[in-house]
């Protein structure tokens, strides 16, 4: 988790002097509770936005937006803590809005936004906005949280972001797999425009089961420039095991931008359809 400095970290708006600060996610009001605390945020919204840096690189960011409730507690609102928690790693990053002037009611509801948290493809986050100071122990909670799922690199908008392109999202291998005679598979795919090697990982399974009955790895050396964007054809020999008929072919590239961690593409060959066994015809007719 990190912040993108594609624009100045600003939280001031007409009628409010405010500054954005790094936060340890442990506000002082946890340790020194206050008697009077503000109410919770209202209408917290999280959206996927896209930000180009000064150099033009494109990153997905979480656009966080919320409003204030129209009660007297805004007189005691000193700021807000924004927290983003990546659910699969438990990594958390926080920033603090510090109000340098007192809020007053005005003709429009107060609204705040922040679009600087860079999010990763195919990750889920919990976004929390805590109004400050935080409540006393057993006080009513004054935060709002929402979960936010970021699409993966297959998503059209995500595909062209820098993190997705770095993992090889623009490569479409268009894999085809056909079963040949004599227990063989022919795998064909389109090479990318980089002199890098590939690996074909074959895993075979019985008809209706998920434990593998055969595994094989095939190395494809780096293509020459004249072979870029051409089809590569590989014939793989299968183990002659009856019923080991469902094959998953996975192609792993080793592009310089992602090395061992590039997006893999796969194709599956199903077991051949078994013809329905016809009912046996009795060779005599019962007379009763």
């Amino acid at each position: 988790l990190r912040l993108l400095d594609h624009r100045a970290l600003v939280c001031s708006q007409p009628g409010l002097n405010c500054t954005v600060k790094n936060s340890t996610c442990l506000d002082d009001s946890w340790i020194h509770p206050r008697n009077l605390t503000p109410s919770s945020p209202k209408d917290l919204q999280i959206q996927l936005h896209f930000a180009h840096t000064q150099q033009g690189d494109l990153f997905p960011v979480a656009h966080i937006e919320w409003t204030l409730q129209t009660d007297a507690s805004i007189l005691y609102l000193e700021g807000a803590e924004l927290s983003v928690l990546q659910l699969n790693t438990n990594e958390r990053l926080c920033v603090r809005f510090e109000f340098l002037s007192k809020l007053r009611h005005h003709h429009r509801r107060w609204r705040f936004t922040f679009s600087h948290f860079v999010v990763d493809p195919d990750q889920e986050y919990e976004v929390t906005v805590h109004h400050l100071p935080k409540p006393i122990p057993d006080g009513d909670p004054n935060h709002q949280s929402k979960n936010f799922l970021v699409p993966d690199c297959e998503h059209a908008r995500m595909k062209v972001t820098t993190p997705c392109m770095s993992s090889g999202s623009l490569w479409d291998p268009n894999i085809t797999v056909e079963t040949l005679e004599a227990h063989q598979l022919r795998v064909s795919f389109t090479l990318w425009n980089e002199s890098t090697h590939y690996q074909i990982l074959l895993t075979s399974f019985p008809h209706m089961e998920n434990h593998s009955c055969f595994e094989h790895m095939h190395h494809i050396p780096a293509p020459r420039p004249e072979e870029f964007h051409q089809r590569s054809n590989v014939t793989l020999t299968l183990r002659n095991l009856k019923g080991c008929c469902r094959h998953q072919v996975q192609i792993q590239p080793f592009f310089s931008s992602c090395l061992n961690d590039c997006l893999r593409h796969s194709a599956t060959v199903s077991c051949p359809e078994m013809p329905d066994t016809p009912e046996p015809i009795p060779d005599y007719m019962p007379l009763w």
């Epitope: 624009r7 936005h49 180009h52 000064q54 150099q55 033009g56």
Partner: nanobody
Framework: QVQLQESGGGLVQPGGSLKLSCAAS????????MTWVRQAPGKGLEWVST?????????YYADSVKGRFTISRDNAKNTLYLQLNSLKTEDTAMYYC??????????????????KGQGTQVTVSS
């Protein structure tokens, strides 16, 4: 100070072509990503295309213009270009060139732009 001056707009029939230019000054042009945004009558600012700074500049396009518009830059001339082909009536808008960072939502509605020029009008009509 940063100056961005667009030119090349005009009236064109559907299916026609135009080439927009943007002359930049007041900053190190080659060090910045550059963008084209547009604003149709009565609508908000819409992101169109961005080109990276640096060698082998990466280009990005909104879905609605992909395959029809081409962004390019000439760092020696401090100029940004946008070639508009197969124009449609819905491409009618004021086109602006923008410098540096920009932020937009999933529908390409611009939320923030660092700096943009005065714009050049493109009208597609029969």
């Amino acid at each position: 100070q940063v100056q961005l001056q667009e030119s090349g707009g005009g009236l064109v029939q559907p299916g026609g072509s135009l080439k927009l230019s943007c002359a930049a000054s007041g900053f190190t042009f080659s060090s910045y990503g550059m963008t084209w945004v547009r604003q149709a009558p009565g609508k908000g600012l819409e992101w169109v295309s961005t080109i990276n700074s640096g060698v082998g500049s990466t280009t990005y396009y909104a879905d609605s213009v992909k395959g029809r518009f081409t962004i390019s830059r000439d760092n020696a001339k401090n100029t940004l270009y946008l070639q508009l082909n197969s124009l449609k009536t819905e491409d009618t808008a004021m086109y602006y060139c923008a410098k540096g960072s920009i932020e937009y939502d999933s529908d390409y509605r611009v939320n923030y732009v660092e700096a943009k020029g005065q714009g050049t009008q493109v009208t597609v009509s029969s």
